[in-house]
């Protein structure tokens, strides 16, 4: 069963020995508590008691999963890829039904020759991984195949892969225009029918760090954002320090609520601090402001 617990007030002690009075739960947030057997674990926000402590769900942490993390781990793939579905017509090989059987000698030899030819054609493309024949059919030999491209993930990966697909198109067009049968002769490894070259489809890996960040931030999605450091995306709230979007709370502590990041100002022995960024200090004895 789930029970609703009352909101308590926590007094935080800063490094200066000052205190912060702050509600430990945002008033507007419905809080649920997980109760396991006799142990009321007080695991909030979907967290569960594992017998020792609360196991919190992203983006929460803390003894009772009551606090929101400042950053969320997002893991872009190490590499991203593109697959181009192409068709070319090879005129220098006679079609036989055996070519349809991928375990036949004919297919294996054709595959070897075609792969070697394509490796030569695309040798200047760093993203090129290889080709994979998907189907062979009559005409002389119509070769349906995939060209596989791969690159390291960077924020500009789509541009890199788009550029590589353009170069693939240029190179296959060039070779199938130049390596053609002349007087029933083909001196190249393979010859082609120029008109048989077609790009059927291009599929590029879809990875959006902003989308992953928003999904993991759940109800805080509007307040978490992605910033890059050394080409790596970081999913951060304004409470995470060291980023462009970081909120400076001066004499206070940054805390996330469902209304966004806010500063909880400290009270020292000598000053009260106030203002949105806790930058307005009021001296307790003289009652004047320091900006």
């Amino acid at each position: 069963p789930l029970a609703t617990i009352p909101v308590s007030t926590t007094s935080l002690t800063s490094s200066e020995g000052s205190t912060i009075s702050t509600p430990s739960v945002d008033i507007s947030t419905p809080v649920t508590t997980s109760i396991v057997g006799d142990q009321c674990s007080r695991c909030k926000n979907g967290g569960f008691w594992d017998g020792l402590k609360c196991q919190c769900l992203t983006p929460y942490y803390g003894e009772s999963c009551e606090e929101v993390v400042n950053s969320i781990d997002i893991a872009p793939p190490e590499t991203v890829s593109a697959q181009m579905e192409l068709t070319v017509t090879v005129t220098s090989v006679k079609f036989t039904d055996e070519l349809k059987n991928h375990s036949s000698q004919e297919f294996r030899e054709f595959n070897k020759t075609f792969t070697e030819q394509m490796n030569i054609v695309y040798s200047g493309i760093p993203e090129y991984v290889g080709v994979n024949i998907t189907n062979l059919r009559l005409g002389s030999v119509v070769v349906e195949h995939d060209v596989l491209l791969r690159t390291k993930y960077t924020p500009e990966y789509k541009t890199a892969l788009d550029n590589a697909t353009e170069v693939v198109k240029q190179k296959i067009t060039k070779v199938t225009t130049e390596q053609i049968m002349t007087n029933d002769n083909c001196s190249a490894l393979m010859c082609f029918n120029t008109t048989g070259t077609q790009v059927q489809n291009i599929t590029v890996t879809q990875y959006d760090p902003v989308e992953e960040c928003r999904q993991k931030a759940e109800e805080y999605e509007d307040y978490f954002l992605v910033e890059y450091r050394d080409q790596k995306p970081y999913c951060i709230s304004p409470c995470e320090s060291g980023f462009n979007a970081s909120k400076n709370c001066n004499h206070g502590k940054c805390q996330m609520s469902q209304n966004g990041a806010r500063c909880l100002c400290v009270t020292t022995e000598t000053h009260w601090y106030s203002g949105e960024d806790c930058n307005q200090g009021t001296q307790k004895s003289h009652h004047h402001h320091h900006h």
Partner: nanobody
Framework: DVQLQASGGGAVQAGGSLRLSCAAS???????MGWFRQAPGKEREGVAG???????IYADSVKGRFTISKDNAKNSLYLQMNSLAPEDTANYSC???????????????????RGQGTQVTVSS
């Protein structure tokens, strides 16, 4: 892959004859086949070729002296060399296309399978 092994080379006097054989590990019926040679310090050159439909082609330097043939039943390729001259001294190797290759009626054709060679030495 198709394995090719040339044999029949040796030392011969100018004007003599030799018959080279090339044993293939698989069916050569529907393949273009060829003979190449490479002399020390020189580039490899095409000597003779036979297309999938039995049409033969020769380098100008060997025309009328060399004859290429194949025995499909034995999966073997041959090169009969007559009136040998010192300039024919080289390492001779055979080559094969993939199955059902067409349009290989020229010596510059790029074969995908190449065999081990056999040495031919012609002394004057």
């Amino acid at each position: 892959d198709v394995q090719l092994q040339a044999s029949g080379g040796g030392a011969v006097q100018a004007g003599g004859s030799l018959r080279l054989s090339c044993a293939a590990s698989g069916d050569i019926t529907r393949r273009c086949m060829g003979w190449f040679r490479q002399a020390p310090g020189k580039e490899r050159e095409g000597v003779a070729g036979i297309s999938e439909d039995g049409i033969t082609i020769y380098a100008d330097s060997v025309k009328g002296r060399f004859t290429i043939s194949k025995d499909n039943a034995k999966n073997s390729l041959y090169l009969q060399m007559n009136s040998l001259a010192p300039e024919d001294t080289a390492n001779y190797s055979c080559a094969a296309s993939i199955l059902n290759r067409v349009g290989c009626r020229q010596l510059s054709y790029e074969y995908i399978y190449r065999g081990q060679g056999t040495q031919v030495t012609v002394s004057s």
